[in-house]
């Protein structure tokens, strides 16, 4: 079964930076990465960025920076520009679209007492499969 | 063949705002993101913003999220952006243009420019 | 935001020769998906909208010269127009395509003896 793993990250010489890590464990052709906060995509939660292996990639505001680290995981840079956007407390979610599979989404959060550079335990949620 | 249609010229007063359009034709609207491009007389291009036609989601360059407002209109495939409290800094030609799904931001496709002037 | 920075800012070159300009990235532009760079480069000839060239550093857009030669990966690329001619007078600019928001670099201009 296949499974989605996500990890957020505080960066330990910049308080107000994070990075969300997201893979995907299984096999199936990726087809489109989307990575929301504050809930799963199209549940609540609000896109910051969509990552297609081809096209290219689209982020929005607060995001900073999507990137494919290899052809099952990705990293987005996001840059808190303080209240208005508490990322110690919000949950990121990671959705992978892949052939033959459908959709498999996994959701993470910086832990309350993470130290900077300290990051999530890699622990596959799934939250949902879309099809 | 696609073709983006712009108006030629603007003149309007500093402190107002402008709508410029870009009409569409030749492609199906909606199937691909309209972007906008702002080039000052003899610089370089900076990108302001883009908008889905098919579901109006907008994306903007943080430098020009509080000046323009991108908005499409689908009974004349016409995409419009709107620029407000203007000042000198915002004379320039403003491009729109399309992509054909090479890459999310290749731009194939551009429209002739619209130049606007801003002096009282 | 990716900067992209050109080089030269002009040159002058005659019919026949050959032309190579460059453009830096701040960051690597490889996708790591694919190994794809996801850099582009535009014709903007006097008086007229830019064109697109090439996208991908390397591929062509359809209809384009074959005298057009993009090429380099990472953050280090090159146009190259193997035997220049009278009509590709124009200012040449770089963009990176790889993510929001897409920047350009300041422009290369074309003139020819």
């Known amino acids: 079964t296949p499974e989605v793993w996500v990890q957020v990250q505080m960066e330990a010489t910049e308080l107000s930076s994070f990075t969300v890590h997201c893979g995907f464990l299984g096999p199936g052709s990726i087809s489109l990465v989307t990575v929301s906060w504050g809930g799963p995509d199209g549940a609540g939660g609000t896109k910051l960025a969509v990552l297609h292996p081809e096209l290219g990639t689209r982020q929005w505001a607060p995001a900073r920076q999507a990137r494919w680290e290899t052809q099952s995981s990705i990293s987005l840079a996001l840059e808190d520009s303080g209240a208005s956007s508490p990322f110690a407390n919000t949950t990121f979610c990671c959705k992978f679209a892949s052939f033959p599979e459908g959709s498999w989404e996994s959701c993470g959060s910086l832990p309350p007492s993470s130290d900077p550079g300290l990051s999530a335990p890699p622990t596959p949620v799934p939250i949902l499969r879309a099809d | 063949q696609v073709q983006l249609q712009q108006p030629g010229a603007e003149l309007v007063k500093p402190g107002t705002s402008v709508k410029l359009s870009c009409k569409a034709a030749g492609y199906i609207f909606t199937s691909s993101w309209m972007h906008w491009v702002k080039q000052r007389p003899g610089q370089g291009l900076e990108w302001i913003g883009e908008?889905?036609?098919?579901?109006?989601?907008?994306n903007y360059n943080e430098k020009f999220k509080n000046k323009a407002t991108l908005t499409v209109d689908h009974s004349s495939s016409t995409a419009y952006m709107q620029l407000s409290s203007l000042t000198s800094e915002d004379s320039a030609v403003y491009y729109c243009a399309s992509n054909a799904d090479r890459a999310y931001y290749t731009m194939d496709y551009w429209g002739q420019g619209t130049s606007v002037t801003v002096s009282s | 935001d990716i900067v992209m920075t050109q080089s030269p800012s002009s040159l002058a070159m005659s019919v026949g020769q050959k032309v190579t300009m460059s453009c830096k990235s701040s960051?690597?532009?490889?996708?790591?998906?694919?190994?794809?760079?996801?850099l582009a480069w535009y014709q903007q000839k006097p008086g007229q909208s830019p064109k697109l060239l090439v996208y991908?550093?390397?591929t062509r857009d359809s209809g384009v010269p074959d005298r057009f030669i993009g090429s380099g990966s990472g953050t280090d690329f090159t146009l190259t127009i193997s035997s220049v001619q009278a009509e590709d007078l124009a200012d040449y600019f770089c963009q990176q395509h790889y993510s929001t928001p897409p920047t350009f670099g300041g422009g290369t201009k074309l003139e020819i003896k």
């Open positions: 960051q690597s532009l490889l996708n790591g998906f694919n190994q794809r760079n996801f």
């Open positions: 908008i889905n036609p098919s579901d109006g989601r907008t």
């Open positions: 991908f550093a390397s």
